[in-house]
C-alpha cells in the first residue's frame, strides 16, 4: 500500500521542515519541576514501542508506522543502559533500584545496593538505598504508585521497599529464618516504610490473613488472604490516616477519586496482578488510564506538588508468554495512560519521563507490506516451505516441534490474542533482553535527558529537577506561580 | 562477578552527579556546521549497539556494559522511524534515500521518490531526489563516500544515484530493456552524476569491462570486470580531474592520502564487498578506520568544508548470515572509525551523526552473568534440556534440526567466529527488523536531533546545519574563524 501523498517529495520535505522548526523552538526550561511522573513500561524495549505504534495506528484505521504514540511526542530522548551489577541482562528488581533510587543493585533484589546478596536476609541492613519517591515525600510532596501488576511487584516496590528477594510479597513467601532475622515482606513495607498517598493496582491477597475470603472471588480459596502473621494490613493502613479510603472495584475508585474528604487512597483490584487489558471486566476493574486519572486527581491537590509512578507492568508478562498480542495491547493502554496524564498536567511544572526497565528478545522483521497486520505473516515462505510471522522471539514458550518440524501458521492463527509467536529456543518463560532502552522526557529539566546514560541517571534527573536530596541546592528557579 | 566499588552507593551517586553536571553544561551551538559527517552502521539496531559495547569493553579486559563506545559519547540522541513508503520493514535502498535525500522511497529503490516503482525503469525520470552530499558539492564543499561494502551498494549509492533497482551495480545487472530505456547502472552514476572527491570501499569489478583481470586476483575470472559496455569507468573518472588518483591497496591509499597533489581519490580494495574485518589482509586492504582517516585528510583541505559518508556496511552482512561474531566485530571497527574521526575533526565546526538504516531480528537475552562472553551460553538449560546462547535471531540460516530436534551447543562452539546463532524460523538470509534505530549527534546544530523522528529528518538536519538547500536562509552564524 503506497499512500499517494507520500509519493510526492514535498510531503516529506514539508514534514521534515516542520519537525526542524519544532526542534529549533525547543527551549530548555530553567525552572524546577513541581511534579514528577515516571511512566514505566515493564519490558518495553524499542521493538515493543515500534510494534505498539503500528498497532495503535492501525486501530485508528491508519497504515501504522507514520502515526504517533503519546510517548513519541515527548521532545527529549536518551538511551538507558539497563544491566545490573551482577548480570548483563537484568530483572525488574535491580532495574527498579536503578531508575527509582539512583543506584544499581543485584538481580532480584530491590532498594538495596549491590553489597546486598539475593536471598540473604542478613545482607539487607545498612545497604538500603532511598527512592526519589521517599525523598519527594520528605520534601512535602504527595506521592503515588499505580500499576497493572500487584502493588508489591518488583517495579513499584522499588519506590518504597528494601528486600533481598523480590518474591517476598507477603510473609508467607518469606522463609521462617529470614523472618526471624527481621526481614519484612514487601506488603508490610508498603504500609510501614513510608507514607504513600495513593496506591492503586493488584495485590489484595498479600494484605490479608490466610483464610480471609476475597471480596470478588469469595468462594475461591486460592484467591483469599495469604498472610501467616494474622495481620490485616489494609486495616492497619486505614488506621494511620484520618482521610484514608480502601477500594477494591472500579465504581468505588471513581467515587473516591472525586471525594474531597479522601486524602489517602488504596485501591487493590485483583488478588494478584490485574487482568490483561483485553481480559479486564470493565465494570469491576479500572483501566490503567482510569487509575492514573484517579491518582492525579488526588495528588494534584497538594500545592507542593507530587511524585507519581505509573507502571504498565504486564507488557512484560505478555512477552514472557511469547504472546505479542497481550504485550502490545498492554503497551497501548500504557500509552493511553501517558496521553491522559498529559491532558491533566502541565509541562510547565511537571517533569514526565517514560522508560522501560529492560527489553525482551522480541523482534519484528520479515519485510511485511506497509499497512499489513503487525500480527500477520511475512511475505513468502521460509526454507521449510512454511509461513512465518513478522513477530518472533529469540527464546520462549512459543517453540514447538510438530512431528519433528516447525509448525506452519496461518494469518488467522497468528492474529489470535492467544497465539504464541515462535522462538529459536524453548523456555517456560521468554527472557528479558539486555539492549539499551529509550527514555522519553518532557517538562522542566527534561533537556538533561540526553545521550547514552546509565539507568541510574533517571532517578538523579528527577531528584535534581525537583530539588530533592541530594540536589536541594539545585539552583533552579521555582516556576512562576508555584505555591509552597 | 560483582566489582567491589560498584557495591557502594557512592559509586553510582557520584557517577550520576557527574553525568548531570555534564548534561547541565550542554550548550546548543548557534553556529552553522562547516563540515558534515554521517556514520552509517548498516543494520546496527540498538541490540547490536549494546552487544558491541560489551564486546568492545571485554576486548579491553573490562566486564563490558559499563564501558563506552565512541558513539555513546555523542551528547544528543533521537530515535529514527525507518519504514519505507511501501514496507513496515525496509531495505538499505529506501532508507538511504530517507537519511541522505530527506525523502522516503520504496523498497529496493534508491534516490527516487515513492512515485517510482521497483524495477520499472520508466518510473525513474522526474522522480529523482537530490542528496545532501550533492547539495554540499554544489555549495562548494568537498565530498566523500567511504564504505566496507562495494561503493555501488545501496547505502553509499543513496548519496549519488537514482535507480529503481538497487541491484543494478554494473550494466551487466541491468536488463537490456531497461538499458534501452536509458536506465544507467549504479557504477556509471558513481562517476557521472556528480563530482565526488573521495570514493573508498569495494566494488572494483563493476568499473571494468568484462574480461579485465582483477589486479589482486588476476587468475580468478569471477573476480574480474563485469561490464558489457566495454567501458573502463576508473579511466573515465581519472580523466575528469587533473589531480585524480586511483588506488586498489592499502599501501597506495596511505601514500595518496599524504600526497598534496591528489585532489580526488578513488580506492577500490576488493572486486565486490570488502572483507570482514576479521578476514582482512592488513597489508593489502585498509580498515574502515584507515579509509576514514585517509578521506578526512583529503577532504579537510577545503576551506569551505566537506560532507563525508562513512559506512560500516557489513554489520548487516554478518547479521544476514546469523553470525553475530561477524556483525559485532564489524560494529567495533565502525566505532573505531568514529573515534578516529573525532580525533581528526573538531565538534566546533563539524556536525557528526551516527545512525543505522534499519535493525535486525537479533536479540541478547537469557540472564547471563556480568562479564560473561557475549557469545556465550545462558545460565541453565532450555525446556529441551539443552544449552542455548544469549544471542539469538528471530529468523535466519542458524535454524537447524538435528534428528528432528534443536541441536545442543557448547561454549566453544558458540564462541567460534563461524557459529550461526539459532533462530525461530529457517531462512536463507536473516531479515532486517522494523524497530526504531538510534541517531547519535555531536557538533553544531546537534541539539536539533531529539525525540522520535522520521528517518528523513536526518538529511534535513544536515542540510539545515550547513545552510544547504533548501535551508540556505538558515540564519546561523558561521563559526568564528571559518574561511570561505
Amino acid at each position: 500500500i503506497i499512500p499517494v501523498e507520500e509519493e510526492n517529495p514535498d510531503f516529506w520535505n514539508r514534514q521534515a521542515a516542520e519537525a526542524l522548526g519544532a526542534a529549533k523552538k525547543l527551549q530548555p526550561a530553567q525552572t524546577a519541576a513541581k511534579n514528577l511522573i515516571i511512566f514505566l513500561g515493564d519490558g518495553m524495549g524499542v521493538s515493543t514501542v515500534t510494534a505498539a505504534r503500528i498497532l495503535k495506528g492501525q486501530k485508528k484505521d491508519k497504515l501504522g508506522p507514520e502515526t504517533f504514540l503519546a510517548m513519541d511526542r515527548f521532545p527529549y530522548v536518551a538511551l538507558s543502559k539497563t544491566y545490573s551489577v551482577d548480570k548483563h541482562v537484568p530483572d525488574s528488581g535491580a532495574t527498579a533500584t536503578a531508575y527509582l533510587c539512583g543506584v544499581k543493585g543485584n538481580f532480584q533484589t530491590i532498594g538495596l545496593s549491590a553489597a546486598a546478596r539475593f536471598n540473604q536476609c542478613n545482607t539487607t541492613r545498612g545497604n538500603e538505598v532511598i527512592s526519589v519517591m521517599n525523598r519527594a515525600k520528605k520534601a512535602g510532596k504527595s506521592v503515588g504508585v499505580v500499576t497493572t501488576t500487584r502493588v508489591q511487584h518488583a517495579s513499584p516496590a522499588g519506590a518504597y521497599a528494601h528486600t533481598v528477594n523480590r518474591n517476598w510479597y507477603s510473609d508467607a513467601d518469606v522463609p521462617a529464618s529470614a523472618r526471624q532475622e527481621g526481614c519484612q515482606d514487601i506488603a508490610t513495607q508498603l504500609i510501614s516504610n513510608m507514607d504513600i498517598d495513593v496506591i492503586l493496582g493488584g495485590g489484595r491477597k498479600y494484605m490479608f490473613p490466610m483464610g480471609t475470603p476475597d471480596p470478588e472471588y469469595p468462594d475461591d480459596y486460592s484467591q483469599g488472604g495469604t498472610r501467616l502473621d494474622g495481620k490485616n494490613l489494609v486495616q492497619e493502613w486505614l488506621a494511620k490516616h484520618q482521610g484514608a479510603r480502601y477500594v477494591w472495584n472500579r465504581t468505588e475508585l471513581l467515587q473516591a477519586s472525586l471525594d474531597p474528604s479522601v486524602t489517602h487512597l488504596m485501591g487493590l483490584f485483583e488478588p494478584g496482578d490485574m487482568k490483561y487489558e483485553i481480559h479486564r471486566d470493565s465494570t469491576l476493574d479500572p483501566s490503567l488510564m482510569e487509575m492514573t486519572e484517579a491518582a492525579l486527581l488526588l495528588l494534584s491537590r497538594n500545592p507542593r506538588g507530587f511524585f507519581l509512578f505509573v507502571e504498565g507492568g504486564r507488557i512484560d508478562h505478555g512477552h514472557h508468554e511469547s504472546r505479542a498480542y497481550r504485550a502490545l495491547t498492554e503497551t497501548i493502554m500504557f500509552d493511553d495512560a501517558i496521553e491522559r496524564a498529559g491532558q491533566l498536567t502541565s509541562e510547565e511544572d511537571t517533569l514526565s519521563l517514560v522508560t522501560a526497565d529492560h527489553s525482551h528478545v522480541f523482534s519484528f522483521g520479515g519485510y511485511p507490506l506497509r499497512g499489513s497486520s503487525i500480527f500477520g505473516l511475512a511475505p513468502g515462505k521460509a526454507r521449510d516451505r512454511k509461513a512465518y510471522t513478522v513477530l518472533l522471539y529469540g527464546n520462549g514458550p512459543g517453540y514447538v516441534l510438530k512431528d519433528g518440524a516447525r509448525p506452519d501458521v496461518t494469518e488467522s492463527e497468528s492474529g489470535s490474542p492467544e497465539y504464541r509467536q515462535q522462538s529459536a529456543v524453548p523456555l517456560d518463560g521468554e527472557t528479558h533482553a539486555g539492549e539499551d532502552v529509550a527514555v522519553f522526557a518532557r517538562g522542566p529539566q527534561a533537556h538533561l535527558v540526553h545521550g547514552v546514560q546509565e539507568q541510574t541517571f533517571i532517578a538523579h534527573v528527577m531528584a535534581f529537577a525537583a530539588c530533592l536530596e541530594p540536589y536541594t541546592a539545585c539552583d533552579l528557579a521555582p516556576r512562576a506561580g508555584t505555591t509552597d | 562477578i560483582i566489582p567491589v566499588e560498584e557495591e557502594n552507593p557512592d559509586f553510582w551517586n557520584r557517577q550520576a552527579a557527574e553525568a548531570l553536571g555534564a548534561a547541565k553544561k550542554l550548550q546548543p551551538a548557534q553556529t552553522a556546521a562547516k563540515n558534515l559527517i554521517i556514520f552509517l552502521g548498516d543494520g546496527m539496531g540498538v541490540s547490536t549497539v549494546t552487544a558491541a559495547r560489551i564486546l568492545k569493553g571485554q576486548k579491553k579486559d573490562k566486564l563490558g556494559p559499563e564501558t563506552f563506545l565512541a558513539m555513546d559519547r555523542f551528547p544528543y540522541v533521537a530515535l529514527s522511524k525507518t519504514y519505507s513508503v511501501d514496507k513496515h520493514v525496509p531495505d538499505s535502498g529506501a532508507t538511504a534515500t530517507a537519511y541522505l535525500c530527506g525523502v522516503k522511497g520504496n523498497f529496493q529503490t534508491i534516490g527516487l521518490s515513492a512515485a517510482a516503482r521497483f524495477n520499472q525503469c520508466n518510473t525513474t525520470r522526474g522522480n529523482e531526489v537530490i542528496s545532501v552530499m550533492n547539495r554540499a558539492k554544489k555549495a562548494g564543499k568537498s565530498v566523500g563516500v567511504v564504505t566496507t561494502t562495494r561503493v555501488q551498494h545501496a547505502s553509499p549509492a543513496g548519496a549519488y544515484a537514482h535507480t529503481v533497482n538497487r541491484n543494478w551495480y554494473s550494466d551487466a545487472d541491468v536488463p537490456a530493456s531497461a538499458r534501452q530505456e536509458g536506465c544507467q547502472d549504479i557504477a556509471t552514476q558513481l562517476i557521472s552524476n556528480m563530482d565526488i572527491d573521495v570514493i573508498l570501499g569495494g566494488g572494483r569489478k563493476y568499473m571494468f569491462p568484462m574480461g579485465t583481470p582483477d589486479p589482486e586476483y588476476p587468475d580468478d575470472y569471477s573476480q574480474g570486470g563485469t561490464r558489457l559496455d566495454g567501458k573502463n569507468l576508473v579511466q573515465e573518472w581519472l580523466a575528469k580531474h587533473q589531480g585524480a588518483r586511483y588506488v586498489w591497496n592499502r599501501t597506495e591509499l596511505l601514500q595518496a592520502s599524504l600526497d598534496p597533489s591528489v585532489t580526488h581519490l578513488m580506492g577500490l580494495f576488493e572486486p565486490g564487498d570488502m572483507k570482514y574485518e576479521i578476514h582482512r589482509d592488513s597489508t593489502l586492504d585498509p580498515s574502515l578506520m584507515e579509509m576514514t582517516e585517509a578521506a578526512l585528510l583529503l577532504l579537510s583541505r577545503n576551506p569551505r568544508g566537506f560532507f563525508l559518508f562513512v559506512e560500516g556496511g557489513r554489520i548487516d552482512h554478518g547479521h544476514h548470515e546469523s553470525r553475530a561474531y561477524r556483525a559485532l566485530t564489524e560494529t567495533i571497527m565502525f566505532d573505531d572509525a568514529i573515534e578516529r574521526a573525532g580525533q581528526l575533526t573538531s565538534e566546533e565546526d563539524t556536525l557528526s551523526l551516527v545512525t543505522a538504516d534499519h535493525s535486525h531480528v537479533f536479540s541478547f537475552g537469557g540472564y547471563p552473568l556480568r562479564g560473561s562472553s557475549i557469545f556465550g551460553l545462558a545460565p541453565g538449560k532450555a525446556r529441551d534440556r539443552k544449552a542455548y546462547t544469549v544471542l539469538l535471531y528471530g529468523n535466519g540460516p542458524g535454524y537447524v534440526l538435528k534428528d528432528g530436534a534443536r541441536p545442543d551447543v557448547t561454549e566453544s562452539e558458540s564462541g567460534s567466529p563461524e557459529y550461526r546463532q539459532q533462530s525461530a524460523v529457517p531462512l536463507d538470509g536473516e531479515t532486517h527488523a522494523g524497530e526504531d534505530v538510534a541517531v547519535f549527534a555531536r557538533g553544531p546544530q546537534a541539539h536539533l536531533v531529539h525525540g522520535v523522528q522520521e528517518q528523513t529528518f536526518i538529511a534535513h538536519v544536515m542540510a539545515f546545519a550547513a545552510c544547504l538547500e533548501p535551508y540556505t536562509a538558515c540564519d546561523l552564524a558561521p563559526r568564528a574563524g571559518t574561511t570561505d
Partner: antibody
Framework: EVQLVESGGGLVQPGRSLRLSCTAS????????MSWVRQAPGKGLEWLAL??????????EYSASVKGRFTISRDNSKSILYLQMNSLKTEDTAVYYC??????????????WGQGTLVTVSS | DTQMTQSPSSLSASVGDRVTITCKAS??????IAWFQYKTGKAPKLFIH???TLQPGVPSRFSGSGSGRDYTLTISSLQPEDIATYYC????????FGQGTKLEIK
C-alpha cells in the same frame, strides 16, 4: 450471579438450518469470551466455536468440524450469544451448551456453562 | 491444532481407592489445562483449572499436576459421589477436550 440460558433447540431435518440462542446475565457481557460446546449421544464434549470480547474486536474461531457451516455471533445490546447452524447433518445431533470464559491465571477457561439445549437432526 | 489424548477411557475402582486419570497434549500447553466433571443430564462442572487450582467447593481429595505435555487428575480417596465422566480441556491454544474417562464403582 452468572447465568446462561440456551434456547432454540429442537428437531430439524438434515440440510436445514437452526439458530441457537444463549441469554446471559449477571456479568458485563461485552468483556468476556463466549463459546459453544456440544455433546453428542454417547460421545464426549466437543468445543465448536468461540467469539472474543470487545477488547479483541469480537473475533471468532471455529473447530475444523463445523467451520464454514456454523457461525457464532453476539448481540451485545441484548446480551445474547447465537450459533447459526446451516447444512445440518445427523451427526450434529447433540446437546449444545453455551459457556463463558473466565480469565484465571491469564488463561481463558470455560468456567460457566448453561444447562444445554437438545438439537436432533433427523429426517 | 492441539490434540488431547486422555486415558483410560473407562475406569472401575473401589471406594477409598486412589484414582489417576492422565491427559497428554500433542504439544506443550504451558499448564493451561482444566478438568471437568460431567454427570448425565447436567452441565459439565469445572473442577480444576491451570493444572492444579481447585475451583471453589471442590473437595480437597481432588488434585491436579503436570507440565509441558503431560497432566494428571488424581482423586486421593474415591467417594461414591465422584462417579461421573471426567474430561480434560486444554485452553492454551483455543480449546480441545480429551475423550473423557468414565469412572465407575467396582
Amino acid at each position: 450471579e452468572v447465568q446462561l440460558v440456551e434456547s432454540g433447540g429442537g428437531l430439524v431435518q438434515p440440510g436445514r438450518s437452526l439458530r441457537l440462542s444463549c441469554t446471559a446475565s449477571g456479568f458485563t457481557f461485552t468483556d468476556y469470551y463466549m463459546s459453544w460446546v456440544r455433546q453428542a449421544p454417547g460421545k464426549g464434549l466437543e468445543w465448536l466455536a468461540l467469539i472474543r470480547n470487545k477488547a479483541t474486536g469480537y473475533t471468532t474461531e471455529y473447530s475444523a468440524s463445523v467451520k464454514g457451516r456454523f457461525t457464532i455471533s453476539r448481540d451485545n445490546s441484548k446480551s445474547i450469544l447465537y450459533l447459526q447452524m446451516n447444512s445440518l447433518k445427523t451427526e450434529d445431533t447433540a446437546v449444545y451448551y453455551c459457556a463463558r470464559a473466565s480469565f484465571y491465571y491469564d488463561g481463558k477457561v470455560l468456567a460457566y456453562w448453561g444447562q444445554g439445549t437438545l438439537v436432533t437432526v433427523s429426517s | 491444532d492441539t490434540q488431547m489424548t486422555q486415558s483410560p477411557s473407562s475406569l472401575s475402582a473401589s471406594v477409598g481407592d486412589r484414582v489417576t486419570i492422565t491427559c497428554k497434549a500433542s504439544q506443550d500447553i504451558n499448564k493451561y489445562i482444566a478438568w471437568f466433571q460431567y454427570k448425565t443430564g447436567k452441565a459439565p462442572k469445572l473442577f480444576i483449572h491451570y493444572t492444579s487450582t481447585l475451583q471453589p467447593g471442590v473437595p480437597s481429595r481432588f488434585s491436579g499436576s503436570g507440565s509441558g505435555r503431560d497432566y494428571t487428575l488424581t482423586i486421593s480417596s474415591l467417594q461414591p459421589e465422584d462417579i461421573a465422566t471426567y474430561y480434560c480441556l486444554q485452553y492454551d491454544n483455543l480449546y480441545t477436550f480429551g475423550q473423557g474417562t468414565k469412572l465407575e464403582i467396582k
